[in-house]
Interface confidence: low
């Protein structure tokens, strides 16, 4: 907007207020300790047109509507959205005064929503949705995604529930070791009018730290009228693509499909190789020759004891006193290794070892040759897809008129902050620097260069 240049001056003035040199108790008694910078909080203000913006710093839920609906997939008495929401600071905030929306309960259904300043119509402007999440207690199983609720005559925010039609669902979600960053949009089939969810491919980036480090992370979705999209975390792109090519299921069905009525002909030959029909078994091929034969060159080792058995009855064994020949049969001493064989190369009847038969051929098989009648692997013919349609502008989604959080979580105290929806990237970036940027600065206030970085960020504004 036209007055934007003046904002740069204002923001630099603000930074003088924001970054105070505050001496802690130690530095008072120790002049050698340099003062540490402390970041003070100032609520962000949108620098241009927005469809929605909320920093929660007024300290109340005004503008947000708690759902009185009952989930339609559970019994009435336990189906209500009874999860608690509050506006509060983070438990271990480094920015006193910086409040956010907090999901307070565990293992409960939560639903809260707010109306946009005006509906977002997908036309010539991009859509940029951005907000912050901090899993203050970590997260075991739960979501922190937003839904952009479709503009319909029936939309009633106090009846917002899991089946309320949405246009886009976006944000982090985790259960067990399954870490997700959803981007789903509901596409209307132009032929049938039926809506179908389209899921963005999974990000290549490792998302785990965003759920586990207990830091505030900034989630941004950018959809452009040329159907391209970008998903950013902490202002870095983690996923990007095109609505036409990178969604599952695809927006547009195949132009052709395999004919379900087509059948493979009975005489279709799919064998790439066949046994050579002209091959003949050679006359000298002996199929009966054994694979092993005795080694005729082997000789019995010297000292072999032919007449000694390998095992003999134990001479020290005695028949048990209670042995009953009628009941137990004739008693025989147990067998033991013949001690005479221990010092000899072997005992008993010597047999020649077996060796591979050099004349062994085995069963004769004709060699395999290329099949002259090979027709390739049969595939059904392609026919025009009767359900085909082509929507080349999936960006033109169903307009939405509200933002909602409809969540279930096994962990409480999920902190949301600084929601913004705009068609102007610059406005959203400014909002990020003035909101999330302060949190980042406060987190690293003791690190050198933070003050400089913030000044540079302000100066970069056009």
């Amino acid at each position: 907007h036209d007055g934007h240049d003046d904002d740069a001056i204002d923001i630099e003035d603000d930074l003088d207020d924001v970054i105070e040199e505050v001496e802690d108790s130690k530095s008072k008694s120790d002049a050698s300790t340099p003062p540490s910078p402390k970041v003070t909080y100032k609520a962000p203000v949108p620098t241009g047109e927005v469809y929605f913006a909320d920093s929660f710093d007024r300290g109340s839920l005004s503008g947000w509507i708690l759902s009185k609906a009952k989930k339609d997939d559970t019994d009435d008495e336990i189906a209500k959205y009874d999860g608690k929401w509050e506006v509060d600071e983070m438990k271990e905030t480094k920015l006193p005064g910086d409040k956010g929306l907090v999901l307070m309960s565990r293992a409960k259904h939560h639903a809260i929503s707010a109306k946009l300043n005006k509906p977002f119509l997908f036309d010539t402007k991009p859509l940029i949705v951005q907000y912050e999440v901090n899993f203050q207690n970590g997260i075991e199983c739960g979501g922190a995604y937003v839904k952009l609720l479709s503009k319909t005559a029936e939309l009633s925010l106090d009846q917002f529930h899991d089946k309320t039609p949405y246009t886009i669902m976006f944000g982090p979600d985790k259960c067990g070791e399954d870490y997700k960053l959803h981007f789903i949009f509901r596409h209307k089939n132009p032929k049938t009018g039926v809506y179908e969810e389209k899921h963005a491919k999974r990000p290549d980036a490792d998302l785990k730290t965003y759920f586990t480090d207990k830091k505030t992370h900034l989630y941004t979705l950018i959809l452009n009228p040329d159907n391209s999209f970008e998903i950013l975390v902490d202002q870095s792109v983690v996923n990007s693509g095109n609505l036409l090519n990178d969604m599952t299921p695809p927006v547009n069905p195949s132009r052709e499909i395999e004919d379900p009525e087509d059948r493979k002909p009975e005489d279709w030959d799919e064998r790439p190789k066949i046994a050579d029909p002209d091959a003949v078994k050679p006359d000298d091929w002996d199929e009966d020759a054994p694979s092993k034969i005795p080694d005729e060159e082997a000789t019995k080792p010297e000292g072999w004891l032919d007449d000694e058995p390998e095992y003999i009855p134990d001479p020290d064994a005695e028949k048990p006193e209670d042995w009953d020949e009628d009941m137990d049969g004739e008693w025989e001493a147990p067998q033991i290794a013949n001690p005479k064989c221990e010092s000899a190369p072997g005992c008993g009847v010597w047999q020649r070892p077996m060796i591979d038969n050099p004349n062994y051929k085995g069963k004769w098989k004709p060699p395999m040759i290329d099949n002259p009648n090979y027709q390739g692997i049969w595939k059904p013919r392609k026919i025009p897809n009767p359900d085909f349609f082509e929507d080349l502008e999936p960006f033109k989604m169903t307009p939405f008129s509200a933002i909602g959080l409809e969540l279930w979580s096994m962990t409480s105290d999920i902190f949301f902050d600084n929601f913004i929806i705009s068609g102007d990237r610059r406005v959203v970036d400014d909002w990020a620097n003035d909101g999330w940027g302060l949190k980042k600065a406060a987190d690293g206030a003791a690190e050198p260069g933070v003050v400089l970085q913030m000044l540079e960020a302000a100066e970069e504004r056009p």
């Epitope: 339609d72 997939d73 559970t74 019994d75 336990i78 189906a79 293992a107 409960k108 075991e140 199983c141 979501g143 899991d162 089946k163 669902m169 979600d173 259960c175 067990g176 399954d178 789903i184 049938t192 039926v194 809506y195 969810e197 899921h199 599952t248 299921p249 969540l407 279930w408 096994m410």
Partner: antibody, heavy 125, light 111 residues
């Protein structure tokens, strides 16, 4: 290893009740929903209902509403399905089944990746 | 009768491609996801396909699912003898507010 182990076969008289248990191991029991599905001899699969193991919320098939009760004991990582007023047509194999992903509607309450071995319930006078 | 309709039987020879259809209505397949299960004799069902066309890990890519309007289909390519089983489709039904299964299709691998 993620597995569901069900209680043994039962023989019941018409009018009686049966309670089948399903013990889960190898995963966080409270993070997933548990469904119950039955199959009469030579028949199709039939969905009976489910329980949100995290908060105990249940949802039953209209066909079994009033006769089936699904409960869970989180300390024992076990889900239970009780069917009352048994009749001969309730003779079937009863399965417990875990959902593939997590406990929210868009996570597909029909994708059961882990199944119990099945419990045969015979109703005969 | 089943809310979702499947052919009672299907057959094919090893290596062939077989398709099993599942027909529903706007309250189930039309507005919800489709799942496919394989059940070998005497065993619990096994998930083959979820959200219309997604395969869980461990399911070979010979199995593929698709959905169009109020119908869905499961395709098996490169048929093997071990594929002989019953196949069930399933979908949530909004009007019944419950999960419904098809009547099942018995797949026979010939030869």
């Amino acid at each position: 290893e993620v597995q569901l182990v069900q209680s043994g076969a039962e023989v019941k008289k018409p009018g009686a009740s049966v309670k089948v248990s399903c013990k889960a191991s190898g995963y966080t029991f409270t993070s997933y929903a548990m469904h119950w599905v039955r199959q009469a001899p030579g028949q199709r699969l039939e969905w009976m209902g489910w329980i949100n193991a995290g908060n105990g919320n249940t949802k039953y098939s209209q066909k079994f509403q009033g006769r089936v009760t699904i409960t869970r004991d989180t300390s024992a990582s076990t889900a239970y399905m009780e069917l009352s007023s048994l009749r001969s047509e309730d003779t079937a194999v009863y399965y417990c089944a875990r959902v593939l992903h997590v406990l929210r509607y868009f996570d597909w309450p029909g994708a059961f990746d882990i199944w119990g071995q099945g419990t045969t319930v015979t109703v005969s006078s | 009768q089943s809310v979702l309709t499947q052919p009672p039987s299907a057959s094919g020879t090893p290596g062939q491609r077989v398709t099993i259809s599942c027909s529903g209505s706007s309250s189930n397949i039309g507005t919800n996801y489709v799942y496919w299960y394989q059940q070998l004799p005497g065993t619990a069902p096994k998930l083959l396909i979820y959200i219309n066309d997604q395969r869980p890990s461990g399911v070979p890519d010979r199995f593929s699912g698709s959905k169009s309007g109020t119908s869905a289909s499961l395709a098996l390519s490169g048929l093997r003898s071990e594929d002989e089983a019953d196949y069930y489709c399933a979908a949530w039904d909004d009007s019944l507010s419950g999960l419904v299964f098809g009547g099942g299709t018995k797949l026979t691998v010939l030869g």
